[in-house]
């Protein structure tokens, strides 16, 4: 299926944005809670599936759009429902930090997509 023309954000750009919104922050989005996700089950779409429910929070909009662009690039991205921990809610900042840790690991090991 056709995807956006512009190249997706790189992993490095995503890391930079995640660092930008988490540094010196104790909380994000007024402490909003989101479902915890298993990032190994397609990290972009998994993280987006949880974070898309956060509204009225300009701080994470760029992250949401980056994840959307990266998730859109995946084959049948819209059809895969990622593994979600439906009994565990965590703060947005915690999910973003978890994502940052995971993405850094992926970047370090060169498995970019």
């Amino acid at each position: 299926s056709p995807s956006p023309v512009t190249p997706s954000p790189t992993l490095k750009e995503l890391i930079e944005e995640l660092v930008n919104i988490t540094q010196n922050q104790a909380s994000l989005c007024n402490g909003s809670m989101v479902w915890s996700v298993n990032l190994t089950a397609g990290m972009y779409c998994a993280a987006l599936e949880s974070l898309i429910n956060v509204s009225d929070c300009s701080a994470i909009q760029r992250t949401q759009r980056m994840l959307k662009a990266l998730c859109s690039q995946k084959p049948a991205a819209g059809q895969i429902s990622s593994e979600r921990s439906r009994d565990t809610k965590i703060e947005v900042i915690q999910l973003v930090k978890n994502l940052l840790t995971y993405v850094r690991g992926v970047y370090r090991h060169g498995n970019f997509r």
């Epitope: 956006p4 509204s55 760029r62 759009r65 991205a77 819209g78 429902s81």
Partner: antibody, heavy 119, light 107 residues
């Protein structure tokens, strides 16, 4: 109050280009992207793409590849959409919009700019 | 790209009747659907985001529901000022796509 004011109607020749402006006010221009959507007469809505004025990053709909250029001027809080190689199928009202509450849901819209392609 | 199929294309109802418009996505878009109202000669107006959240100032007679691939916009009691075209939008992934629209008229 968030406001988006677009440039006036344009009549252009087939094969030419058009540049539509969208002047914003009432919020910090670099906080939210500017989206562009068009609507052909009596038809539905079609998303063209967006620009993030914060870093100039753009995402375009594949249907407009190679023909559309989105730019933003931070000094005047104005966004621009340029569409080239115009044809009859491009006759439409072109809207700019922003999404503040929910990412990618455009809740503040310009008044629209009618672009007519005619020789 | 994700295709949104909206139905019906048009409907004509009496004042105070219940209006139901559906939007079916070609693939799972979770709850990332919004609804817009557009009156002739005007820009679209956002009513609902993330399937069921009403924007500030939108009358409570408008409600949205659904998730996955099937979504509904309901007007509980049709008022004359509700005569307009209604569009759904999926904002799960790019390119963002709209339904073809539903024209709501008064009998």
């Amino acid at each position: 109050e968030v406001q988006l004011v677009q440039s006036g109607a344009e009549v252009v020749k087939p094969g030419a280009s058009v540049k539509v402006s969208c002047k914003t006010s009432g919020y910090s221009f670099t906080d939210y992207p500017i989206y562009w959507v068009r609507q052909a007469p009596g038809a539905g809505l079609e998303w063209i793409g967006y620009i993030d004025p914060y870093n100039g990053g753009t995402t375009y709909n594949q249907n407009f590849k190679d023909r559309v250029t989105l730019t933003a001027d931070k000094s005047t809080s104005t966004a621009y959409m340029e569409l080239s190689s115009l044809r009859a199928g491009d006759i439409a009202v072109y809207y700019c919009a922003t999404a503040v509450v929910a990412t990618d849901v455009m809740e503040n819209w310009g008044q629209g700019t009618l672009v007519t392609v005619s020789s | 790209e994700i295709v949104l199929t909206q139905s019906p294309a048009s409907l004509s109802l009496s004042q105070e009747e219940r209006v139901t418009i559906t939007c079916k996505a070609s693939q799972n878009v979770r709850n990332a659907v919004a609804w817009f109202q557009q009156k002739p000669g005007q820009a679209p107006k956002a009513l609902i985001y993330l399937a069921s959240n009403r924007y500030t100032g939108v009358p409570s007679r408008f409600s949205g529901s659904g998730s996955g691939t099937d979504f509904t916009l309901t007007i509980s009691s049709l008022e004359p000022e509700d005569v307009a075209d209604y569009f759904c939008l999926q904002h799960w992934n790019y390119p963002l796509t709209f339904g073809a629209g539903t024209k709501v008229e008064l009998k």
